[in-house]
């Protein structure tokens, strides 16, 4: 079976790598433009130049192409703590990331907030925060792990999941609670 | 006591349109960036669409790019979506929140208004 092609993909697949068929005649293949640059005008004829022309500042064009207009270079987004790796150029679009000691959590693909990474307080690093992944903790005995933090067992209450972590804490608290009873 | 009350939910033919509200209280309204997000029957949280303090930048999923509209109006302590062309798959309970400061997590989001979109 061959597999489905869009019409734009169908009309370059006809020419060679690097070239593209023109929009109104068939029978001729244009070179593509340079990265960096958008389709002015497609070529007039066989062996004849493709019109291209750079593109304006705030937008770029990160590959070979024959786009009629350069893409809109991306904004970082100050609301989700990005701040700018590398400024768009008109063949690379704006680079966003995270300050030191922070990294990035994807909500979904195109969108990241930046959060600090964890220092394990009353635990110890068992993995070190990456660019994409916060620091993984083991917390010390008594300690259990909550929304990444190191949280006291004396805050686990029978119903949350640290019940099993802080159980031996829990029957000593219900002893001790016990004996003061009698 | 951060509260967030969603409402304007309900049951809508595909191609329809909703006006949901996030009423604010208990803290700051015009300091903080606010959220939308939906849970889709034995889905997980998406985020929807998040709109800055002022009102100047806004963030739309990919699935509701075009069709969805999100403002808010910081005398009113309110958030909107408005809802445009719905789809079946648009179908969730969408909840307002609190953009997470601490960590990916929402600390604060409201109890949800469900959205059904059927014919």
């Known amino acids: 079976l061959v597999p489905h092609l869009g019409d734009r993909e169908k009309r370059d697949s006809v020419c060679p790598q690097g070239k593209y068929i023109h929009p109104q005649n068939n029978s001729i293949c244009c070179t593509k433009c340079h990265k960096g640059t958008y389709l002015y005008n497609d070529c007039p004829g066989p062996g004849q130049d493709t019109d291209c022309r750079e593109c304006e500042s705030g937008s770029f064009t990160a590959s070979e192409n024959h786009l009629r207009h350069c893409l809109s270079c991306s904004k970082c987004r100050k609301e989700m703590g990005q701040v700018e790796i590398s400024s768009c150029t008109v063949d690379r679009d704006t680079v966003c990331g995270c300050r030191k000691n922070q990294y990035r959590h994807y909500w979904s693909e195109n969108l990241f907030q930046c959060f600090n990474c964890s220092l394990c307080l009353n635990g110890t690093v068992h993995l070190s925060c990456q660019e994409k992944q916060n620091t993984v903790c083991t917390c010390h005995a008594g300690f259990f792990l909550r929304e990444n933090e190191c949280v006291s067992c004396s805050n686990c209450k029978k119903s949350l999941e640290c019940t099993k972590l802080c159980l031996p804490q829990i029957e000593n608290v219900k002893g001790t609670e016990d004996s003061g009873t009698t | 006591e951060v509260q967030l009350l969603e409402s304007g939910g309900g049951l809508v033919q595909p191609g329809g349109s909703l006006r949901l509200s996030c009423a604010a209280s208990g803290f700051t309204f015009k300091n903080k960036t606010m959220v939308w997000v939906r849970q889709a029957p034995g889905k997980g949280l998406e985020w929807v669409s998040h709109i800055d303090q002022e009102g100047e930048g806004t963030y739309y999923a990919d699935s509701v790019k075009g069709r969805f509209t999100i403002s808010r109006d910081n005398s009113k302590n309110t958030l909107y979506l408005q809802m445009n062309s719905l789809r079946a798959e648009d179908t969730a309970v969408y909840y307002c929140?609190?953009?997470?400061?601490?960590?990916?997590?929402?600390?604060?989001r409201g109890q949800g208004t469900l959205v059904t979109v059927s014919s």
């Open positions: 929140a609190l953009l997470p400061k601490r960590g990916p997590w929402f600390d604060y």
